[in-house]
Amino acid sequence: DGNSTRSPETNGLLCGDPEENCAATTTQSKRKGHFSRCPKQYKHYCIKGRCRFVVAEQTPSCVCDEGYIGARCERVDLFY
């Protein structure tokens, strides 16, 4: 579930609002797990995609819009 469109195919359950306790670094999560919406502080974390929270790791991850790649969906996919 890496670079995909904004679709609800990777729903998980809420991890909560960790507020300042959230880790600020991440890469795109490639393994299955429980996801939730990212806390509000990560509202603009994903440049061209949707942010979701990896519950087990308490870290944000991005689901990129079509045509974008990168940990924060910040790069255009030249092969798209």
Partner: antibody
Framework: QVQLLESGGGLVQPGGSLRLSCAAS????????MSWVRQAPGKGLEWVSG???????TYTDSVKGRFTISRDNSKNTLYLQMNSLRAEDTAVYYC?????????????WGQGTLVTVSS | SYELTQPLSVSVALGQTARITCSGD??????VHWYQQKPGQAPVLVIY???DRPSGIPERFSGSNSGNTATLTISRAQAGDEADYYC?????????FGGGTKLTVL
């Protein structure tokens, strides 16, 4: 259109059991997190339990160990198995769809089913 | 556990502006959503993510959220706006609802 329809409510004695069902239609049920929310007569809304599409579950403290949320994606149905029922569980039970992942908001609600726990 | 506090009731004159508050510790750091519920009916989402409006909800409904208070504002109140209103947020693997506010349109 997008719709949720609850069933299974009724009168049950304290200590008894009941299973609620929520039939979903008009959307890809398996892709959404779902919740149960209840409302005691004349009272406010209270979230009961939630279930992610990968099977992760969570419950409000007052029902832990007594209620079990589950789903059958092949039948587009959400369930709530309620055991050891108490008078304070009396309420209208709504199933609700969470927009995208859990942690968003409830954008679709069912009409509710009434559960009455009384001797 | 996290708590959201709403006034039990709010009254507004027909055509005037009603404001319903929802208080919680650092609520401005959370997403807040608002639901309208009329007697005998299921709740309906009227504001999500603090201030966004679902399709079909009149522009008269708006929301804001900062500090310790979120506010639902209903401008040019109509008789059909009379209902119970609930705020909702998320905290530590659970959903939290406010106690609800009964809006009366005079």
């Amino acid at each position: 259109q997008v719709q949720l329809l609850e069933s299974g409510g009724g009168l049950v004695q304290p200590g008894g059991s009941l299973r609620l069902s929520c039939a979903a239609s008009g959307f890809t049920f398996s892709s959404y997190a779902m919740s149960w929310v209840r409302q005691a007569p004349g009272k406010g809304l209270e979230w009961v339990s939630g279930l992610g599409h990968v099977g992760y579950t969570t419950y409000t403290d007052s029902v832990k160990g007594r209620f079990t949320i589950s789903r059958d994606n092949s039948k587009n149905t959400l369930y709530l198995q309620m055991n050891s029922l108490r008078a304070e569980d009396t309420a209208v039970y709504y199933c609700a769809r969470d927009y995208l992942d859990f942690g968003y908001y409830f954008d679709v609600w069912g009409q509710g089913t009434l559960v009455t726990v009384s001797s | 556990s996290y708590e959201l506090t709403q006034p039990l009731s709010v009254s507004v004159a027909l055509g005037q502006t009603a404001r319903i508050t929802c208080s919680g510790d650092k609520i401005g750091k959370k997403y807040v959503h608002w639901y309208q519920q009329k007697p005998g009916q299921a709740p309906v989402l009227v504001i999500y993510d603090d201030s966004d409006r679902p399709s079909g909800i009149p522009e008269r409904f708006s929301g804001s959220n900062s500090g310790n208070t979120a506010t639902l504002t209903i401008s040019r109140a109509q008789a059909g706006d009379e209902a119970d209103y609930y705020c909702q947020a998320w905290d530590m693997q659970s959903v939290v609802f406010g106690g609800g506010t009964k809006l009366t349109v005079l």
